[in-house]
């Protein structure tokens, strides 16, 4: 899915209002220096990519977080604010269910969340250029300078 | 325990250049966007620019564009605010500052300041 | 950019009494719903400290006798009791839009 057509601005506010809290409910307890981040993103589009990518699809050692409260959050803010998202999804979500059927949080999980962390972190806060300045070499973001 | 720990006061000549540091530990550097503020005396915060250190991303205000260059080292977890073609009007104690963990753009911690004194 | 103008400039107000400070922005500051705004306390000699974030969020480890309401262009901070210890000089900032800016100050003090 391309998600250069997403409501950024909208997608933010559902992670600052919800979604956020959820992660830290999820970490709770895990100290934030516990896990480095290795996994990065360079515009809105590739962070979106990248969430969706962390939440949803098992890896090795996390399986289940597409059934947390924070996944689910999540998912609802990427089929309301991005159109075709939903369709998208429907093989995936059937390929979920087949996955998973417990919630289990492994230390595995709870690094990928720490991820998932940093990755909404810079999401919501990239480094908008100012019209008139030239130093954002990020071409994507460009019609979000007033959004910061 | 999250700090950053600024480089030490700096007295120059106006025309000449300064380079304060800010040393960051306690959290993954790389992740967050780190901010550079201006407090000159008798007056209020002024916002100088961001900079991402995963990338080195920046971001300034136009005010500083011309003079001011934000840079890091990831491998010291380090980051730099270079003011050139000093005056006396940059006399100010300077903040580095790092955003906060979840993206709602303020400043939670705070390095302690570097006083920069400008004069002839 | 973004002029933020708070009021009053200065303000005493005796201990245990309620104190409020203005600030408003040149455009508004909100953005899907959401108030980017915040709040921070600077006491001499010392860096600025968060007190309240989105405009009416807590801060971690704020006492509640700070309080902050407002949207769009319209905010306010509120200290509810006056304490020795608030003495210092608040900020208000937006950041919703570059550049990141604050407002002047506006330095309280004990009556």
């Known amino acids: 899915y391309d998600f250069t057509n997403c409501d950024f601005e909208k997608i933010k506010a559902a992670y600052l209002s919800t979604i956020s809290k959820d992660l830290i409910t999820y970490m709770s307890g895990t100290k934030s220096t516990e896990f480095n981040n290795t996994v990065s993103c360079s515009n809105r589009p590739h962070c979106l990519t990248e969430i969706q990518s962390l939440t949803f699809n098992p890896t090795a050692g996390c399986a289940s977080l597409a059934k947390e409260m924070f996944a689910m959050k999540t998912k609802a803010a990427l089929a309301i604010w991005c159109p075709g998202y939903s369709e998208t999804q429907i093989n995936a979500t059937q390929a979920m269910k087949k996955a998973r059927k417990s919630k289990v949080t492994t230390n595995k999980c709870l690094e990928q969340v720490s991820q998932l962390q940093g990755l909404w972190r810079r999401f919501n806060r990239p480094l908008l250029k100012q019209q008139g300045s030239s130093d954002y070499k990020d071409d994507d973001d460009k019609h979000h300078h007033h959004h910061h | 325990e999250v700090q950053l720990v600024q480089s030490g006061a700096e007295v120059k000549k106006p025309g000449s250049s300064v380079k304060v540091s800010c040393k960051a530990s306690g959290f993954t550097f790389s992740t967050y966007n780190m901010h550079w503020v201006k407090h000159a005396p008798g007056q209020g915060l002024e916002w100088i620019g961001a900079i991402y250190p995963g990338n080195g991303e920046t971001s300034y205000n136009q005010k500083f564009k011309d003079r001011a260059t934000l840079t890091v080292d990831k491998s010291t977890s380090t980051a730099y605010m270079e003011l050139s073609s000093l005056r006396s009007e940059d006399t100010a104690v300077y903040y580095c500052a790092r955003e906060d963990d979840y993206g709602e753009g303020y400043f939670d911690v705070w390095g302690q300041g570097t006083t920069v004194t400008v004069s002839s | 950019d973004i002029v933020m103008t708070q009021s009053p400039d200065s303000l005493a107000v005796s201990l245990g009494e309620r104190a409020t400070i203005n600030c408003r922005a040149s455009?508004?500051?909100?953005?899907?719903?959401?108030?980017?705004m915040h709040w921070y306390q600077q006491k001499p000699g010392q860096p600025p400290k968060l007190l309240l974030y989105?405009?009416?969020n807590l801060g971690s480890g704020i006492p509640d006798r700070f309080s902050g309401s407002g949207s769009g262009t319209d905010f306010t901070l509120t200290i509810s009791s006056l304490q020795a210890e608030d003495v210092a000089v608040y900020y208000c900032?937006?950041?919703?839009?570059?550049?990141?800016?604050f407002g002047q100050g506006t330095k309280l003090e004990i009556k």
């Open positions: 455009e508004s500051v909100d953005n899907s719903g959401l108030s980017f």
């Open positions: 900032q937006q950041i919703n839009t570059d550049p990141l800016t």
């Open positions: 989105r405009a009416s």
